[in-house]
Interface confidence: low
Amino acid sequence: EAIQVTQPSVVLASSHGVASFPCEYSPSHNTDEVRVTVLRQTNDQMTEVCATTFTEKNTVGFLDYPFCSGTFNESRVNLTIQGLRAVDTGLYLCKVELMYPPPYFVGMGNGTQIYVIDPEPCPDSDF
């Protein structure tokens, strides 16, 4: 079964290398367990950045991942990726799986292009 996953097309990371964006799905289902995976697409390969499972009791995710955090509310996940550098610029896709109870639903967003600009080094100053 399919669900529609929406995410912003472009996000600019902060100067500290932090990018935040929402990942929403519809239609909303009464689901006990929602699996959210952030994937990075490079050429024809997908690489998992982080993944977590949200439940009614567990609405804060990605505890296993130092660079990812997220909160879940109804059919919206607010995702934050930290520690980004210019080389991490790329397309990040949000995959949502409604794991339980059956039926299984799955959907993939079109991706969020995250742009990361490394901060200019502070010039030396004489005091």
Epitope: L39, T47, E48, T53, T55, M99, Y100, F105, V106, M108
Partner: antibody, heavy 116, light 111 residues
Framework: QIQLQESGPGLVNPSQSLSLSCSVT?????????WNWIRQFPGQKVEWMGF???????YYNPSIKSRISITRDTSKNQFFLQVNSVTTEDTATYYC?????????WGQGTMVTVSS | DIMMTQSPSSLSVSAGEKATISCKSS????????????LNWYLQKPGQSPKLLIY?????HTGVPDRFRGSGTDFTLTISSVQDEDLAFYYC?????????FGAGTKVEIK
């Protein structure tokens, strides 16, 4: 850090029951995922046996469904495997594993020999 | 049950060379909604438990080196430049349907 640890007798007599436990640390087994038992026979063949879901439902491999039971103790964050009427064909290394489609965390395995 | 057939059963490769392992399923593993195949790859080093390498046929699990590559079309696992530490058994596994089933495994040896 999530860890799974199997424990149980290394030797079981034919026709008896085999009981194994899996202790999970770093994640509550009632918070999510399926909690699985998988075994690997001496010839390296791997067989998925079944799981208990985080909310308590179970699903077993039909090939051994009549002989196995998977239960849990949420207060100890453990889940268990019982295999009845064992034969020498049940000699294997038994693993517990966490699953959401794929098995991302495994225990180190416990070797069980069925022999008289 | 879905049968998973792996080939070859063993493979001997020199360090730095490419290794390719094939997995065939007795029926389609493609989920049209997910637009992906429900196939996973694991490696098992001597004396250790299996470890997840790739899921959805081509998505590398966190921390897996990019020399490991899964094809989403023909179910092959390629190690682009084999390292000594890649000595292991490799297994494919389907989760398209219950019961989950594994291939018989491919033993990769280093020459």
């Amino acid at each position: 850090q999530i860890q799974l640890q199997e424990s149980g007798p290394g030797l079981v007599n034919p026709s008896q029951s085999l009981s194994l436990s899996c202790s999970v640390t770093g994640y509550s087994i009632t918070s999510g995922y399926g909690w699985n038992w998988i075994r690997q026979f001496p010839g390296q063949k791997v067989e998925w046996m079944g799981f208990i879901y985080y909310e308590g439902s179970t699903y077993y491999n039909p090939s051994i469904k009549s002989r196995i039971s998977i239960t849990r103790d949420t207060s100890k964050n453990q889940f268990f495997l019982q295999v009845n009427s064992v034969t020498t064909e049940d000699t294997a290394t038994y693993y517990c594993a966490r699953q959401t489609g794929y098995f991302d965390y495994w225990g180190q395995g416990t070797m069980v020999t069925v022999s008289s | 049950d879905i049968m998973m057939t792996q080939s070859p059963s063993s493979l001997s490769v020199s360090a730095g060379e490419k290794a390719t392992i094939s997995c065939k399923s007795s029926q389609s593993l493609f989920n049209s909604n997910a637009k992906t195949n429900y196939l996973n790859w694991y490696l098992q080093k001597p004396g250790q438990s299996p470890k997840l390498l790739i899921y959805y046929a081509s998505t590398r699990h966190t921390g897996v080196p990019d020399r490991f590559r899964g094809s989403g079309t023909d179910f092959t696992l390629t190690i682009s430049s084999v390292q000594d530490e890649d000595l292991a058994f490799y297994y494919c596994q389907q989760w398209y349907d219950y019961p989950y089933t594994f291939g018989a495994g491919t033993k990769v040896e280093i020459k």
